[in-house]
């Protein structure tokens, strides 16, 4: 893979340890927490990033209505188990033997159980709805300009091909970005929508995962777009399985 050869760093993941111990003295980078080798020419998987984050020292109407099966990441951070490819294992457990099933973006999709809980497959999240509220501006942004700039951002910064940005909706001050990527659409080398959404989420929070890259400076026709709230909904290819108790809570 390509890491910055001159100073041996990982441009796409600052939560790595890099050294020139690859084949032929090439720079090789390993993710903190897991020690797994990462491809620095593309985004690192969300699972490896979460694992690295948990190992690091702690620091302080045109709009879409998410479907009844949309998941929100209410559980927050946890130390995930990743498979050899860096994907989330379908079953995650904590230190107290409480287990649950997750989707491909690591969000819980079942009730919590014990070690007997079975998660037969890693269910793919094929539709992500990123719901943003921007800070007040003099006037509303032009919808088509906003759409174009956000598509450009996902292509330029996160390597996500425009075909996976299904739509951009705008009703001031709410912006919704729909990412869609079915298993059949994702070719070798394509960035996963879950990874792109995670990098975007961290960028929006001012916690960029890139090494030495400037922070996110999003502008629409020169006007800064500053986000004050983000909510992300995840839709899986198979609806989640929660008990009625949770649904009525």
């Amino acid at each position: 893979h390509t890491a910055a050869q001159d100073n041996c760093t990982c441009p796409t993941n600052k939560m790595t340890v890099c050294s020139p111990d690859g084949p032929g003295g090439r720079c090789q980078c390993r993710a903190l927490g897991s020690g797994m080798a990462v491809d620095c020419s593309t985004l690192t998987s969300k699972c490896l990033l979460l694992k690295a984050r948990m190992s690091a020292p702690k620091n302080a109407r045109t709009l879409v209505r998410p479907s009844e099966h949309a998941l929100v990441d209410n559980d927050g951070l946890y130390d995930p188990d990743c498979d050899p490819e860096g994907r989330f294992k379908a079953r995650q457990c904590n230190q107290t033997s409480v287990c649950w099933c997750v989707n491909s973006v690591g969000v819980r999709r079942t009730d919590k159980g014990d070690l007997s809980l079975r998660c037969d497959e890693l269910v793919r999240t094929h539709h992500i709805l990123i719901d943003l509220r921007h800070r007040p501006t003099a006037g509303a942004f032009n919808h088509s300009d906003l759409d174009a700039e956000l598509r450009r951002l996902f292509r330029e910064r996160y390597r996500l091909h425009p075909k996976f940005v299904a739509a951009v909706h705008y009703e001031q001050p709410t912006i919704q970005i729909e990412l869609r990527q079915n298993t059949s659409q994702k070719a070798a080398g394509d960035v996963d929508i879950g990874d792109a959404a995670y990098y975007f989420e961290r960028d929006i929070k001012g916690e960029s995962l890139f090494q030495g890259r400037g922070g996110l400076d999003l502008r629409v026709r020169g006007e800064p777009l500053q986000v004050e709230r983000t909510l992300i909904y995840y839709l899986d290819e198979i609806p989640p399985k929660f008990s009625m108790k949770r649904l009525t809570a």
């Epitope: 450009r152 292509r155 330029e156 390597r159 394509d190 890259r213 400037g214």
Partner: antibody, heavy 120, light 107 residues
Amino acid sequence: EVQLVESGGGLVQPGGSLRLSCAASGFTFSTYTMSWVRQTPAKGLVWVSTINSDGYNIYYSDSMKGRFTISRDNAKYTLYLQMNSLRAEDTAMYYCARCSYYSYDYFDYWGQGTLVTVSS
Amino acid sequence: DIQMTQSPSSLSASVGDRVTITCRASENIDNYLAWYQQKQGKVPKLLIYAATNLADGMPSRFSGSGSGTDFTLTISSLQPEDVATYYCQHYYSNQLTFGQGTKLEIK
């Protein structure tokens, strides 16, 4: 007026190396994705490589990956293509091309090209 | 990789004729298709993007149509200055490919 001027082509022996340059002017270079495309009478136009505006995202044609390295210097308004282990089949006219601003990978401006000949 | 096949490879038509060139993708590419015009001894010039959008400065007699796998470039009334080779190119994936070209001549 957008201008792209390639240089660095010439005659090189098989196994040799060349570094092509493309000097850009007439637009804000640091905001555009850039590419190299080559052309031969036999194969027509063939995409070689693309680099995004800040140089973080790079794509290569599968058939050229490993031998060619694309890079850019935004301060100098210059795009580069380092070509190693050259083969006879790399003989072509090499064009530097600007991608559309919104990063859809089609080419809205092309340079005049620089000819690379690989022969012993 | 996605293969792009143009037909015909060459064609000859009279001034004023309606000319169509087709481009077929080996798999669905939605509307991620561009057409270029390259005159003899010149560099390629963007003609159409997103399958149907005419590039700035190109004459309105050129138009593009199609989506999915089948695309057409049409010249409504052929002019002498349209003599060139025309190429299609997909940008649906990260591996970009061009058609082999269609050489257009005047009868």
